[in-house]
């Protein structure tokens, strides 16, 4: 039975040209995290495998940095980066947990962080 929950940074906004940290946290489970996938819509951004380490997709190599932790740092943001991001936690023996973050990249300097929320 899957008892865990994923807490994410929720809906966030950032300035064009700036950077943002995408962060998820899996709690309420003793399951072992074997791999975390970061995806933007249906595109793979990065993978962190417990045994094999980090892999950043070639098309994002110059703008995506691993960490902190299992999170992901997006740099040199453009308005095209606006959209949904998913952290997918592969765990043993529970299975897969998915968290969603919505990022809005703003032209102006009025970017604010949204509230945190939980996905069961």
């Amino acid at each position: 039975m899957m008892t865990g929950t994923i807490e994410t940074t929720g809906n966030i906004s950032a300035e064009k040209g700036g950077s943002i940290i995408l962060q998820c946290h899996l709690s309420s489970t003793t399951a072992q995290v074997t791999q975390v996938n970061w995806e933007q819509q249906d595109q793979l951004l990065a993978i962190c495998n417990a045994d094999l380490g980090w892999h950043i997709s070639p098309s994002f190599k110059d703008r995506v940095a691993p960490g902190p932790g299992l999170g992901l740092t997006l740099q040199s943001l453009t308005v095209n980066d606006t959209g949904e991001y998913f952290c997918i936690y592969h765990t043993y023996p529970d299975g897969t947990y998915t968290g969603r973050i919505f990022l809005e990249v703003l032209e102006s300097s009025v970017a604010e962080h949204g509230a945190r929320f939980q996905i069961p």
């Epitope: 074997t34 249906d42 793979l44 045994d51 094999l52 997918i88 592969h90 299975g95 897969t96």
Partner: antibody
Framework: QVQLVQSGAEVKKPGASVKVSCKAS????????MHWVRQAPGQGLEWMGV????????SYAQKFQGRVTLTRDTSTSTVYMELSSLRSEDTAVYYC??????????????WGQGTMVTVSS | EIVLTQSPGTLSLSPGERATLSCRAS???????LAWYQQKPGQAPRLLIY???SRATGIPDRFSGSGSGTDFTLTISRLEPEDFAVYYC?????????FGGGTKVEIK
């Protein structure tokens, strides 16, 4: 062209160990991950583990953890799979398979010809 | 782990006919992290399709893959004599990477 050539068939007694080799050619050996998959007679395919390009990183299926060891020798472009504490259920054809991508994508693009390992007393 | 169930177990068809093979996952395979392999007796498997629908290098266009989520299909538009073999689906979304039990396509 890309080729993976495996060592010959082995017959082992229960409790023994076996070491199967997989020699790669036709590509940059240090750029790709290598998987190992086995197939028991008349059965389907079972992923065992994967080893990184430098040999520094490995990941094993839970089922084989502690019994399988993957290593690689860059000087000879060879990957090795050692399975210990053999039992009759380990009788199978063992395949090495090169990953399709520059990481452990899990897509097994090129396969060795297979090595039959028979475990019998 | 993700369990893949293939159906039917055996498909009896004649050359020239269309073959439709099914693969169902026990949980959603995001972004179509699914591959298909062909295996002939005494030979190693051969990669046919990855990403659910992308053909591997050198694979003829009579082979096509489709589907997303939990339901995937491999279609062989017109069976050639060399296509009679066992076909396996495989997910590479969630480790450990797993294979289906296979579908045997045999000559009717």
């Amino acid at each position: 062209q890309v080729q993976l050539v495996q060592s010959g068939a082995e017959v082992k007694k229960p409790g023994a160990s076996v070491k199967v080799s997989c020699k790669a050619s036709g590509y940059t050996f240090t750029s790709y991950y290598m998987h190992w998959v086995r197939q028991a007679p008349g059965q389907g395919l079972e992923w065992m583990g994967v080893i990184g390009p430098s040999g520094a990183s490995t990941s094993y299926a839970q089922k084989f953890q502690g019994r399988v060891t993957l290593t690689r020798d860059t000087s000879t472009s060879t990957v090795y799979m050692e399975l210990s504490s053999l039992r009759s259920e380990d009788t199978a054809v063992y395949y090495c398979a090169r990953d399709h991508s520059d990481y452990w994508s899990g897509i097994m693009e090129v396969w060795g010809q297979g090595t039959m390992v028979t475990v019998s007393s | 782990e993700i369990v893949l169930t293939q159906s039917p177990g055996t498909l009896s068809l004649s050359p020239g006919e269309r073959a439709t093979l099914s693969c169902r996952a026990s949980q959603s395979v995001r972004s179509s992290y699914l591959a298909w392999y062909q295996q002939k007796p005494g030979q190693a498997p051969r990669l046919l399709i990855y990403g659910a629908s992308s053909r591997a290098t050198g694979i003829p266009d009579r082979f096509s893959g489709s589907g997303s989520g939990t339901d995937f299909t491999l279609t062989i538009s017109r069976l050639e004599p060399e296509d009679f073999a066992v076909y396996y689906c495989q997910q590479y979304f969630s480790p450990p990477w797993t294979f289906g039990g296979g579908t045997k396509v045999e000559i009717k």
